[in-house]
Interface confidence: medium
């Protein structure tokens, strides 16, 4: 039966959740009613064989290999270990046991689509004009921001932040052209007057 | 925008099979895992399966395998589903929907397939 | 595989009450998401992650839950919430949706 030392499922009226031989109406923690009686709910780890009787205890048996069950419970069937498939680009961050499922996560540059994760995106890229905010992670994608007056970005990137436009004027030089969000500006020696 | 748009309706014979596309426009279909969902008389909702935009690798609802593929063109960002030999049971409207935050974020105008003789 | 029930299958409501429908899962899921859909239009994100709200819902609509019991409210309802609500799971293939719940308004 498995049961933990602490919790053992004894048979007395205690245990019945009655009085007077009246059948019980509600059970103790970590027991379910069946049949006018409380029976031992199967710990993690392991499912449900058959209820009890007034003459024998819950039948509990150990989940399989690649199965899992997390919590006090009376299901006849364990659930199947999460697989997490490189075709979506998952991989395993910690396989599972007996009463915890394995948890997948994404491959270097890839991050879930959502928090369950169930399948996997690249990093999202920041367009010309956009910088990167905050770089992505395996549960979070980059997070992008339009550069402002006076920055720019002229590349696709997952990594680079906005670039400040150079300083014509620390270079004795002036602006021969304009910036944008996506050009830095041109520098160009000043016209002398002849 | 993110938009989905899918190819317009359909009437089909039994026994045949027949493609649905979905196109994405407003970001990089790459972005986001595709997703295709069924939906009988208005209500129920199933979902078929999914792929993985950028590696192409699918994953099934086993009562759909053999009834759906699931393929994606990155070059011109369609996704494309599928349906082979055709029954009245699989008249419905097919949904395509762009999974990228946790949920089913963007959803195509769905497609409506009618299968009779 | 995993059902969802949601309940009741059908509600009506008056402008202004406060609307609870439920969505319990035949086993335990991490997340459940919500989706609402208006007749002849797709269904759109409304709440995913069990509590985020989807851009451009009203704050009169939360989420929560965890386990096997998920529900949506919404505070105050209003005319323009007249629609069909969707939970889904994302917890084992098949990934499923519940049978919804049709919300009407007086």
């Known amino acids: 039966d498995y049961k933990d030392d602490d919790d053992k499922d004894y048979k007395d009226d205690d245990d019945k959740g009655g009085s007077g031989g009246e059948p019980p109406t509600a059970c103790r923690e970590k027991q379910y009613l069946i049949n006018s009686q409380c029976c031992s709910l199967c710990q993690p780890g392991q499912k449900l064989v058959s209820d009890c009787t007034e003459f024998t205890e819950t039948e509990c048996l150990p989940c399989g290999e690649s199965e899992f069950l997390d919590t006090w419970n009376r299901e006849t069937h364990c659930h199947q270990h999460k697989y997490c498939d490189p075709n979506l680009g998952l991989r395993v961050q910690q396989k599972g046991t007996s009463e915890t499922d394995t948890i997948c996560t994404c491959e270097e540059g890839w991050h879930c689509t959502s928090e369950a994760c169930e399948s996997c995106v690249l990093h999202r890229s920041c367009s010309p004009g956009f910088g990167v905010k905050q770089i992505a992670t395996g549960v979070s994608d980059t997070i992008c921001e339009p550069c402002p007056v006076g920055f720019f970005s002229n590349v696709s990137s997952a990594f680079e932040k906005c670039h400040p436009w150079t300083s014509c004027e620390t270079k004795d030089l002036v602006v021969q052209q304009a910036g944008t969000n996506k050009t830095d500006v041109v520098c160009g020696p000043q016209d002398r007057l002849r | 925008e993110v938009q989905l748009q899918q190819s317009g309706p359909e009437l089909v014979k039994p026994g045949a099979s027949m493609k649905i596309s979905c196109k994405a426009s407003?970001?990089?279909?790459?972005?986001?895992?595709m997703n295709w969902v069924k939906q009988s008389h208005g209500k129920n909702l199933e979902w078929i399966g999914l792929?993985?935009?950028?590696?192409?690798?699918?994953t099934y609802n086993q009562k759909f395998k053999g009834k759906a593929t699931l393929t994606v063109d990155k070059s011109s960002s369609t996704a494309y589903m599928e349906l082979l030999s055709l029954t009245s049971e699989d008249s419905a409207v097919y949904y395509c929907?762009?999974?990228?935050?946790?949920?089913?974020?963007?959803w195509g105008q769905g497609t409506s397939v009618t299968v009779s003789s | 595989q995993i059902v969802l029930t949601q309940s009741p299958a059908i509600m009506s409501s008056s402008p202004g009450e406060k609307v609870t429908m439920t969505c319990s899962a035949s086993?335990?899921?991490?997340?459940i998401h919500w989706y609402q859909q208006k007749s002849g239009t797709s269904p759109k994100r409304w709440i995913y992650?069990?509590?985020k709200l989807a851009s451009g819902v009203p704050a009169r609509f939360s989420g929560s839950g965890s386990g096997t019991s998920y529900s949506l409210t919404i505070n105050s309802v209003e005319a323009e919430d007249a629609a069909t609500y969707y939970c889904?799971?994302?917890?084992?293939?098949?990934?499923?949706f519940g049978g919804g719940t049709k919300l009407e308004i007086k």
């Open positions: 792929i993985n935009t950028y590696t192409g690798g699918t």
């Open positions: 992650d069990t509590s």
């Open positions: 889904q799971q994302w917890r084992t293939n098949p990934y499923t």
């Open positions: 929907a762009g999974t990228g935050t946790g949920a089913m974020d963007y």
């Open positions: 407003g970001y990089s279909i790459t972005g986001y895992t």
């Open positions: 086993s335990s899921v991490s997340y």
